[in-house]
């Protein structure tokens, strides 16, 4: 940051990802000010003419807000005074992806920072034993993914083994015609082993584990957003 007559202040953003149809958060923090009325927050998006959101004099100022964000944005008004300029984005759309900028003006100074926002769909996989199959089979299902992910199976016992020949993955378009349901079936499963179904696209990586023994079945799921510093 350079120095102007009104000093530059540090503004920090975090790259993040939004799940289509759900609410997302564009993270931005700044050096706080003692007076809420002296703080101005402006969010812009590359390629959009109007503002994404503006907050000034302690309240939203939406007269210049772009149509594509109408009724979908909010700041955490009670947290602005402590330096939180993060934006809540309702009902994330695929077209919300892009480069955003968080502009801050306070009595202490001015600053801004860019943020890359990715959009897609990602969900936790659930792995179950498929009792309907003729042989011991595992079925991994995840309801919403976009873009189309890759699915890889792994096993604790056979580490490094390639299961592509003994698995079958299908993608079924959901009713909104964007996201897809992911179903992957693993055949010839052995007992007393832990299997992992790993689903990944450029936005998220999710893993569903299942431990199958003679006496019990244990499941665990985990989802991690990629290229996000959070």
């Amino acid at each position: 940051f350079g120095i102007s007559g009104r000093h530059s202040i540090t503004v920090t953003t975090v790259a993040s990802a939004g799940n289509i149809g759900e609410d997302g958060i564009l993270s931005c923090t700044f050096e706080p000010d003692i007076k809420l009325s002296d703080i101005v927050i402006q969010w812009l998006k590359e390629g959009v003419l109007g503002l994404v959101h503006e907050f000034k004099e302690g309240k939203d100022e939406l007269s210049e807000q772009d149509e594509m964000f109408r009724g979908r944005t909010a700041v955490f008004a009670d947290q602005v005074i402590v330096g939180n300029a993060s934006l809540r984005l309702k009902n994330v759309q695929l077209t919300d992806a892009g480069t955003y900028k968080c502009y801050i003006i306070t009595s202490k100074g001015k600053g801004n920072a860019n943020l890359e926002y990715k959009t897609g769909a990602f969900s936790m996989p659930e792995v179950n034993v498929d009792y309907n199959a003729s042989s011991e089979t595992l079925r991994c299902e995840a309801p919403r993914w976009f873009p189309q992910p890759t699915v890889v199976w792994a096993s604790q016992v056979d580490q490094g083994a390639n299961f592509s020949e003994v698995s079958n993955t299908s993608f079924e378009l959901n009713s909104e015609n964007v996201t897809m349901k992911v179903v992957s079936v693993l055949y010839n499963v052995t007992i007393n082993n832990t299997y992992s179904c790993m689903i990944e696209n450029d936005i998220a990586k999710a893993t569903g584990d299942i431990k199958v023994t003679e006496s019990e079945i244990k499941r665990r799921s985990h989802l991690q957003l990629l290229n996000s510093k959070a």
Epitope: E46, G47, L49, N112
Partner: antibody, heavy 117, light 106 residues
Framework: EVQLVESGGGVVQPGRSLRLSCAAS????????MNWVRQAPGKGLEWVSA????????YYADSVKGRFTISRDNSKNTLYLQMNSLRAEDTAVYYC??????????WGQGTTVTVSS | SYELTQPPSVSVAPGKTARITCGGN??????VHWYQQKPGQAPVLVVY???DRPSGIPERFSGSNSGNTATLTISRVEAGDEADYYC?????????FGTGTKLTVL
């Protein structure tokens, strides 16, 4: 290399129409808002119009509102300015410029429009 | 509508520092951009968002913005800096340009 090349200027009589084009290359055209800016002979810069990356939002200067129409064809990477009911005071060099946040970071070399009887 | 006022001309000797001002109501609450335009050429962005320089612009060009005045400072002025300079802001869905300043290198 990012490049903007304007065309379509010329001499036109008052009340007539003209369409300017701006061919863009070297960047993802559809993801950037674009502007038209003009400069009358010996005068300063005057913003004319702006359009969002998708083309869904447009803004105009009061001096051209209702007479000029900005548009874009993202499949052809081209920006347009349809100028109707031209007046002598529309005589200027017309520049297309790429919007960058609150400013403009890349400009074309301009095309000259002369409105004269 | 919002207005930006610049001095019509500024003269400076080579090697000295030139300061070009841009005045506007509460200008410090806006983000100011500066353009250089040489005769017969298109404008070139030299300072954006008050203080930042695009790549390829010499460090001799710097900006500041406070109160009602923004300033473009060109240190160690060279003959090739002779041009018209315009400040610009965004206000109420319009781009506003300053009146322009002709920099003459003596």
């Amino acid at each position: 290399e990012v490049q903007l090349v304007e065309s379509g200027g010329g001499v036109v009589q008052p009340g007539r129409s003209l369409r300017l084009s701006c061919a863009a290359s070297g960047f993802t055209f559809s993801s950037r808002s674009m502007n038209w800016v003009r400069q009358a002979p010996g005068k300063g810069l005057e913003w004319v119009s702006a359009i969002s990356g998708s083309g869904s939002t447009v803004y105009y200067a009061d001096s051209v509102k209702g007479r000029f129409t900005i548009s874009r064809d993202n499949s052809k990477n081209t920006l347009y300015l349809q100028m109707n009911s031209l007046r002598a005071e529309d005589t200027a060099v017309y520049y297309c410029a790429r919007k960058r946040w609150y400013g403009m970071d890349v400009w074309g070399q301009g095309t000259t429009v002369t409105v004269s009887s | 509508s919002y207005e930006l006022t610049q001095p019509p001309s500024v003269s400076v000797a080579p090697g000295k520092t030139a300061r070009i001002t841009c005045g506007g109501n509460k200008l410090g609450d806006k983000w100011v951009h500066w353009y250089q335009q040489k005769p017969g050429q298109a404008p070139v962005l030299v300072v954006y968002e008050d203080v930042d320089r695009p790549s390829g612009i010499p460090e001799r060009f710097s900006g500041s913005n406070s109160g009602n005045t923004a300033t473009l400072t060109i240190s160690r002025v060279e003959a090739g800096d002779e041009a018209d300079y315009y400040c610009q802001v965004w206000d109420s869905r319009t781009y506003v340009f300053g009146t322009g300043t002709k920099l003459t290198v003596l």
